[in-house]
């Protein structure tokens, strides 16, 4: 039967029906309606926002729109003691001092409640001492200054530049290397890409244009006063020395301007190579101190930014499905913005709207997905994921039994040049499927699939003909659902030429000149990305709400599972000499590996093949493929990570965006030939291809037959 | 928009000093060094030395070193550039000019420029 | 110091014909970061210079296209595709890379 008669509906309400509702002058309103003012979480006009969108969301039809309030640890400047930057002299007079905001965008300058730029959650303190330049502050800079270079950071104030890692990443490696504070910039290098003016007159960040973020190293434990539990009315909080995740040292953004005038004077050593060096004309000394006549002045910070208990609220919709309203398909977005948000989340809630009304007018027509969608306005994802984690640990029993697939919602451009995927293997087939079916917005490729134009300009590295499709790392809302829920999740979006275009991210990310002017003139004046990215994301989310069988190709996880273990293994053969000292064999792996590959082999067969008007093997057969990503979670969570739980994916140690396959053998061997017990560090290597092996072989069990 | 307004004529007597004001509207005075650059027919455009508003630090071209002396009133947004010991040939258009930071770091914006006449 | 060069000194030039200075200087404008600090200046008459090219061959804003700059090293050109009477002036070469920093002596240009 076709997914119009599973629930008995006119054949006219088919995917074609949803995506031909969707309408990018609609995207374009609400997006312009979403981002006049500031919608910081906890504060009164997000509340205000919240409101809003649950009225308009029981309008377009919902059967229910509920808000889900928390009382959660979020962070603030303080308003009457601003945070700031000095250079100090021998006197302790302040003889320069970063700017307290940014200059604000034409047309808002009347504008209150811009929140200046403040790194979230930093504890308050005035640290005073010698600059040392960290380059990227990844792991593998701090090696190159402590190992290589033997310049060590202990007692002194670090200034990283952003991008390439998550700046919660940076943070925990200043720490460990001692450092009293941080301060982070953003460089052109990084953030202005060559040949664009910056805003209002192009897309380029201004030099006193700063990123806001959070530097938290949660590793998805929600809300750090309650970890694993919902921030609700009778929760108990952890004291804020026992909070999760809260950095121990302070921290500062600043723009390219002020980053100049500390940089210009840094002394010491040259920067170990070119990669060290930005776009400023500085040295790039790494330190550390300033250099000759500047020797005798330090860099002094001043952080009075609290951490306060507040309240935030999700906006949950539901649209309940006509067949199986036990099975959930989740879209979810961020609301809270840093600013305007103009991009980030605004252009991806504006989808999200959109998405709701579509459905809305299908449901007002008689129409009912087969499964029930939630729909998700998340909150205070912008200070750790927060509104999502809570919600879900205050549903996990009904998430980890219910839960088929959740698709994530944040910005729905990073660029405009072709669409960027990151999803489960489960949702390849879908993914290309789709997208075989959807016109591309591309210039060049007028009357030519999606598929065609994504895989033309973003190849798969491994197989030609097809696209890149990327691991889930984290840094969004899908990560409890995906890496500590095991539900199948995925993202979509519109994104740069990474290979032109070096810079981090977006130039304006996190900065107040994220506007709608911003996406409206310079990034996709007709709206035509954003409708492409809504018609993949609400066609993937209509898809695993409607279709009989569920979507989902559990060969695509053999194929990736034998990449993994090879890339896994080479990486532990780079030290054959201990691999044969302690008897490491992956051997265990790879015939988990063969065993899955078979299994999913006969399961597909299966599934071609089975009577689907049988509604009991149907649901039986669709089970089998809902926990298969729940197949792979381990309770008991990675090594010091209780909240990664997924075997095969989890955010990388060292970059919390990036995903990381095998994790759990991956962070075993990471720098092992440091490691002063090696016995014990190898030991550890063997006990983690142990559970890998041991976790894939038991996935596969779940899809053999069930008698 | 940017703009370098600067102090009118002056004509002094050798030996005697010269102080010239540059004021500074329409961006952040502070984010951006000024340099002063002065003009004659013997020797065209010759760079004195910057001063960064900011922190006050100065920057002076060695052949001018003890006899100028660059100053800035941040709450005036604007600077000022002070040449001791005059000599006939300090006889100049004394201009004050914008360092235009990232992306250019050249002078994107000069002042009208300020005639000094150096005679006995 | 750094020694800028510019040649010719004069160059009287058709309209609708192009034109090009050449600017040596006497080391390298290579800064660390890669970037070379080489810039254009126009000056009109009885005006004050402006900026017209930076960092060797990127325009400043409200400067025409038939203004491009090249070269590398030590070695830099400026050509005008096709001189307007607007463009009468002097043109200066500069650098930035080095303190002090420096200019040329300058290029008259005029209309034959």
């Known amino acids: 039967k076709s997914s119009n008669e599973a629930t008995n509906i006119t054949p006219k309400h088919n995917m074609k029906a949803f995506l031909d509702e969707l309408k990018a002058e609609n995207i374009k309103k609400f997006l312009y309606n979403f981002t006049q003012i500031p919608h910081l979480a906890g504060t009164e006009q997000n509340f205000q926002l919240a409101k809003q969108i649950q009225s308009q969301w029981k309008e377009f039809g919902l059967d229910s729109v509920e808000l889900a309030h928390y009382d959660v640890l979020l962070s603030y400047p303080n308003k009457t003691h601003p945070n700031y930057i000095s250079i100090i002299n021998e006197d302790g007079n302040e003889i320069f001092n970063t700017s307290l905001f940014e200059p604000p965008p034409p047309g808002y300058e009347n504008v209150s409640d811009i929140v200046p730029p403040f790194s979230a959650f930093s504890p308050q303190g005035m640290p005073e001492g010698d600059l040392v330049y960290v380059n990227y502050a990844r792991t593998e800079d701090f090696f190159k200054l402590e190992r290589d270079m033997k310049i060590n950071c202990s007692g002194k104030i670090v200034i990283a530049r952003y991008g390439k890692v998550f700046r919660g990443n940076k943070v925990k490696n200043a720490q460990l290397a001692g450092a009293k504070g941080v301060i982070l910039y953003s460089d052109p290098a990084d953030y202005f890409a060559p040949g664009v003016k910056s805003y209002p007159d192009g897309w380029n960040l201004p030099g006193g244009g700063v990123q806001r973020g959070n530097i938290l190293n949660l590793n998805g434990a929600g809300d750090p006063l309650t970890p694993g539990y919902p921030a609700n009315e009778y929760a108990y909080r952890r004291g804020i020395a026992e909070a999760v995740g809260l950095p121990s040292i302070p921290v500062h953004p600043i723009g390219y301007y002020d980053a100049q005038k500390l940089l210009e004077k840094m002394g010491g050593s040259a920067p170990p190579d070119s990669s060290w060096r930005g776009s400023l004309k500085v040295p790039y000394n790494v330190g550390p101190g300033f250099t000759g006549n500047f020797s005798t002045q330090k860099v002094k910070m001043h952080i009075h930014s609290t951490n306060e208990v507040t309240r935030i609220y999700n906006v949950i919709g539901t649209l309940r499905g006509a067949v199986e309203p036990d099975r959930y398909v989740i879209l979810g977005g961020h609301r809270d913005s840093w600013v305007f948000g103009g991009i980030d989340p605004q252009s991806g809630a504006a989808v999200v709207h959109e998405i709701v009304r579509s459905f809305g007018t299908l449901k007002k027509e008689g129409w009912r997905p087969r499964r029930t969608i939630l729909f998700a306005s998340w909150d205070a994802e912008e200070f750790g994921l927060l509104g999502s984690t809570e919600w879900a640990e205050e549903n996990s029993r009904l998430l980890q039994e219910r839960g088929v697939a959740y698709i994530n919602a944040d910005s729905s451009i990073e660029g405009n040049y072709t669409l960027r995927v990151d999803c489960t293997p489960l949702m390849y087939s879908l993914v290309h499927n789709l997208t075989k079916e959807l016109k591309s917005p591309d210039e060049g490729f007028e009357g030519k699939s999606l598929y065609e134009s994504w895989t033309k300009k973003s190849p798969s590295p491994e197989f030609s003909g097809m696209p890149r499709i990327s691991k889930l790392g984290s840094g969004n809302d899908f990560e409890v659902f995906f890496q500590r829920l095991g539900i199948a999740s995925g993202r979509a979006r519109y994104t740069k030429n990474w290979e032109t275009n070096k810079f981090s991210g977006y130039p304006l990310y996190h900065s107040v000149y994220e506007t709608y002017e911003l996406v409206e003139k310079f990034y996709d004046p007709m709206f035509k990305y954003h409708l492409t990215v809504a018609q993949v994301r609400g066609g993937m989310v209509f898809e695993l709400a409607n279709s009989i069988v569920l979507p989902f190709d559990c060969r695509d996880y053999a194929v990736v599972l034998r990449k993994y273990a090879d890339k896994i293994y080479s990486i532990s053969m780079k030290h054959p000499q201990e691999m044969k000292t302690y008897s490491v064999s992956f051997d265990s792996l790879f015939s988990a590996v063969k065993n899955f590959t078979e299994i999913a082999s006969k399961f597909s067969e299966r599934l071609q093949d089975f009577d689907k008007s049988n509604p009991i093997v149907l649901r039986m057969m669709n089970d089998q493929l809902m926990f298969l990503e729940r197949a792979f979670i381990d309770p008991l969570g990675l090594p010091d990570r209780p909240f990664y739980r997924h075997v095969i994916y989890a955010p990388s140690s060292h970059n919390k965006y990036a995903g990381e396959s095998f994790p759990g053998i991956y962070d075993a061997l990471f720098d092992i030939e440091s490691k002063v017990d090696p016995s014990k560090a190898w030991g550890e290597v063997k006990r983690q291809i142990y559970v890998a092996a041991f976790t894939v072989q038991a996935a596969a069990e779940t899809l053999s037959e069930v008698a | 928009q940017v703009q370098l307004v600067q102090s009118g004529a002056e004509v002094k007597k050798p030996g005697a000093s010269v102080k010239l004001s540059c004021k500074a509207s329409?961006?952040?005075?502070?984010?951006?060094?000024i340099n002063w650059v002065r003009q004659t027919p013997e020797q065209g455009l010759e760079w004195m030395g910057g001063?960064?508003?900011?922190?006050?630090?100065?920057n002076y071209n060695e052949n001018f070193k003890g006899r100028v002396t660059m100053t800035r009133d941040t709450s005036k947004s604007t600077a000022y550039m002070e040449l001791s010991r005059l000599r006939s040939d300090d006889t100049a258009v004394y201009y004050c000019?914008?360092?235009?930071?990232?992306?250019?770091?050249?002078?994107?914006?000069w002042g009208q420029g300020t005639t000094v006449t150096v005679s006995s | 110091d750094v020694v800028m060069t510019q040649s010719p000194l004069s160059l009287p030039v058709t309209l609708g014909e192009p034109a090009s200075i050449s600017c040596r200087s006497s080391q390298s404008l290579v800064y660390s970061n890669g970037n070379t600090y080489l810039h254009w200046y126009q000056q009109k008459p009885g005006q004050s210079p402006r900026l017209l090219i930076y960092?060797?061959?990127n325009r400043f804003s409200g400067v025409p296209d038939r203004f491009s700059g090249s070269g590398s090293g030590t070695d830099f050109t400026l050509k005008i595709s096709r001189v307007e009477a607007e463009d009468v002036g002097v043109y200066f070469c500069s650098q930035s890379t080095h303190v002090p920093y420096t200019f040329g002596q300058g290029t008259k240009l005029e209309i034959k």
């Open positions: 000019a914008r360092d235009g930071n990232f992306p250019y770091y050249a002078m994107d914006s």
């Open positions: 329409g961006y952040t005075f502070t984010y951006f060094d």
């Open positions: 960092k060797v061959s």
């Open positions: 001063i960064s508003p900011g922190d006050g630090n100065t």
